[in-house]
């Protein structure tokens, strides 16, 4: 018996073939010997079955022996043994029908569950692996998890069905609700603009929910929200912002806000969360800022940061063009009566200077 | 494509010294912090010594303190590291590696070179 | 120095098997750990930075997790080639230390 597997919803085409390339008689008939559908000369006849709307041959086909069986729509419940009669001949075909569908959503929030449910007809035992957008390959029976979904799962699953040594491909499309970035940090002078960005991972055509800013100053003891927001179809409106500061937010996608300037008691980390209109959880991103403050006060010029660094950044002042008069792993650095000229701040690390601040020192007279 | 090539290893005694260099090809030498790791024969990796972009900052595991000197010459694409003094616990696989810097937040030892072996006998 | 110390020192799996690595800090490092795997007469090979971050072109069976002073590294689904040494690196302040590793060998 010849065993084909259909996908719910596709069509199928069953074939069915007669020793003589001509126009004869054949009867599609289910198992239960009802029939589905015929000919009558060049004319198709259809018969009681279920199958009655969804069925249909290729007359163009007839003349060549050929008596195809069309099933439209299929359905999980059309998984049954076809028989083709022509030519006092039996062909038999078993066709069995798999739906393979996720089961919420198919926009799912970073770290949250995919289960993928295989539909298989009564008496089916397949197997089903699935394999991810970045290569990821899970295996199951009739049900498939994934814990902890990442930005990479986003795209298209490719799950293939196996029954009978033979293979049917669902293709599913996963979006996974993410910012692009799950944490940035912004190095920036004392007074200078201040720009967070928060670009998502993901576009859909309407865009709806509520968002905060909270932010934790290195100088403070407690957190505080800085700003409240509203979306709607990817239109952002200020619902509630502090008076200090007065932060300024976009009114379109990607989600900007602006700090007026960057001060000592701004520097520290904030945590944007952002929760989707029919989704349980919050999307969250975080973001940080070090400030970095030159001074001259008398004889003594002092460079410090503010904010989250990694303890192996090291903070320099040094004279234009000369070697660093002073150098450390902390977060201030100062030079007694420095000598005249154009000094230069630098935060660095192993790669790079992350943020510079130039300071004239006026000759003494 | 990005590449490092150890070489200057070999057998030498306990007491003397050895400079190892390290070829860097494939990118832009001077904007990486670049590394010496090791491994002695049955043992795991040792973190030796860090030199930054510029030459300016180096910092060694305190096994090799005032014994290795790590430096570089960014118009030769080349890291050294001279090591003196030698002991035969300094016998091991010595690699090269570079360190990427993300927003000076994320750090990591991204492209190794093959190694070369360094023998300290008597 | 900040001491690293990994578990198990060896371990003893099958193809298909999922496998935990855990390392310790002796004090916070934040999110500053990576995860390498070493073969014998190769190159180390980086999997993870940043504790939780796949590097490019690390196949997505490797994960890595944690902050502060303990981090995890799982194999979901052990391939023959995974069969190797692997190390914990914190990369949070100089000097930089290495875990003991742990030596994952067939079953």
């Known amino acids: 018996k010849k065993v084909v597997l259909g996908k719910k919803g596709d069509t199928v085409e069953l074939t069915c073939t007669a020793s003589q390339k001509k126009s004869i008689q054949f009867h599609w008939k289910n198992s239960n010997q009802i029939k589905i559908l015929g000919n009558q000369g060049s004319f198709l006849t259809k018969g009681p079955s279920k199958l009655n709307d969804r069925a249909d041959s290729r007359r163009s086909l007839w003349d060549q022996g050929n008596f195809p069986l069309i099933i439209k729509n299929l359905k999980i419940e059309d998984s049954d043994t076809y028989i083709c009669e022509v030519e006092d001949q039996k062909e038999e075909v078993q066709l069995l029908v798999f739906g393979l569908t996720a089961n919420s959503d198919t926009h799912l929030l970073q770290g949250q569950s995919l289960t993928l449910t295989l539909e298989s007809p009564p008496g089916s035992s397949p197997s089903v692996q699935c394999r991810s957008p970045r290569g990821k390959n899970i295996q199951g029976g009739k049900t498939l998890s994934v814990s902890q979904l990442e930005l990479q799962d986003s795209g298209t699953w490719t799950c293939t069905v196996l029954q009978n040594q033979k293979k049917v491909e669902f293709k599913i499309d996963i979006v996974v609700l993410a910012f692009q970035k799950a944490s940035s940090i912004v190095y920036k002078k004392e007074g200078e603009q201040v720009e967070f960005s928060f670009p998502l991972a993901f576009t859909v055509e309407k865009l709806t929910g509520s968002g905060e800013l909270w932010w934790q100053a290195e100088r403070a003891s407690s957190s505080k929200s800085w700003i409240t927001f509203d979306l709607k179809n990817k239109e952002v409106s200020v619902k509630r912002v502090t008076q200090d500061p007065k932060l300024q937010m976009g009114k379109k996608l990607p989600l900007h806000l602006t700090l007026p300037q960057a001060l000592p008691q701004y520097a520290g980390s904030g945590n944007l969360t952002l929760a989707l209109e029919a989704k349980t959880g919050k999307l969250h991103q975080e973001v940080n800022l070090v400030v970095m403050r030159a001074t001259q006060l008398q004889k003594n010029l002092t460079c410090e940061v503010w904010g989250p660094t990694s303890p192996k950044l090291m903070l320099s002042l040094k004279l234009e063009n000369k070697e660093a008069k002073v150098s450390k792993r902390e977060k201030a650095v100062w030079v007694l009566n420095p000598e005249a000229g154009m000094w230069q701040c630098l935060l660095s690390d192993s790669g790079q200077v992350l943020l510079e601040s130039n300071i004239k020192v006026l000759p003494t007279w | 494509q990005v590449q490092l090539v150890e070489s200057g290893g070999g057998v030498v005694q306990p007491g003397r010294s050895l400079r190892l260099s390290c070829a860097a090809s494939?990118?832009?030498?001077?904007?990486?912090?670049m590394h010496w790791v090791r491994q002695a024969p049955g043992k795991g990796l040792e973190w030796v010594a860090i030199?930054?972009?510029?030459?300016?900052?180096?910092y060694y595991a305190d096994s090799v303190k005032g014994r290795f000197t790590i430096s570089r010459d960014n118009s030769k694409n080349t890291l050294y590291l001279q090591m003196n003094s030698l002991r035969a616990e300094d016998t091991a696989v010595y690699y090269c590696?570079?360190?990427?810097?993300?927003?000076?937040?994320?750090?990591?030892?991204?492209?190794w070179g093959k190694g070369t072996t360094v023998t300290v006998s008597s | 120095a900040i001491q690293m110390t990994q578990s198990p020192s060896s371990l003893s799996a099958s193809v298909g098997d999922r496998v935990t690595i855990t390392c310790r800090a002796s004090?916070?490092?934040?999110?500053?750990l990576g995860w390498y795997q070493l073969k014998p007469g190769k190159a180390p090979k980086l999997l993870i930075y940043?504790?939780?971050s796949l590097q490019s072109g690390v196949p997505s069976s490797f994960s890595g997790s944690g902050s502060g002073t303990d981090f995890t590294l799982t194999i979901s689904s052990l391939q023959p080639e995974d069969f190797a040494t692997y190390y914990c690196?914190?990369?949070?302040?100089?000097?930089?230390?290495f875990g003991q590793g742990t030596k994952l060998e067939i079953k």
């Open positions: 494939g990118f832009t030498f001077s904007s990486y912090g």
């Open positions: 004090q916070g490092i934040r999110n500053g």
């Open positions: 940043a504790a939780s």
């Open positions: 030199i930054w972009y510029d030459g300016n900052n180096k």
């Open positions: 590696t570079r360190e990427v810097a993300l927003e000076g937040y994320y750090y990591y030892m991204d492209v």
């Open positions: 690196l914190q990369d949070y302040n100089y000097p930089y230390t």
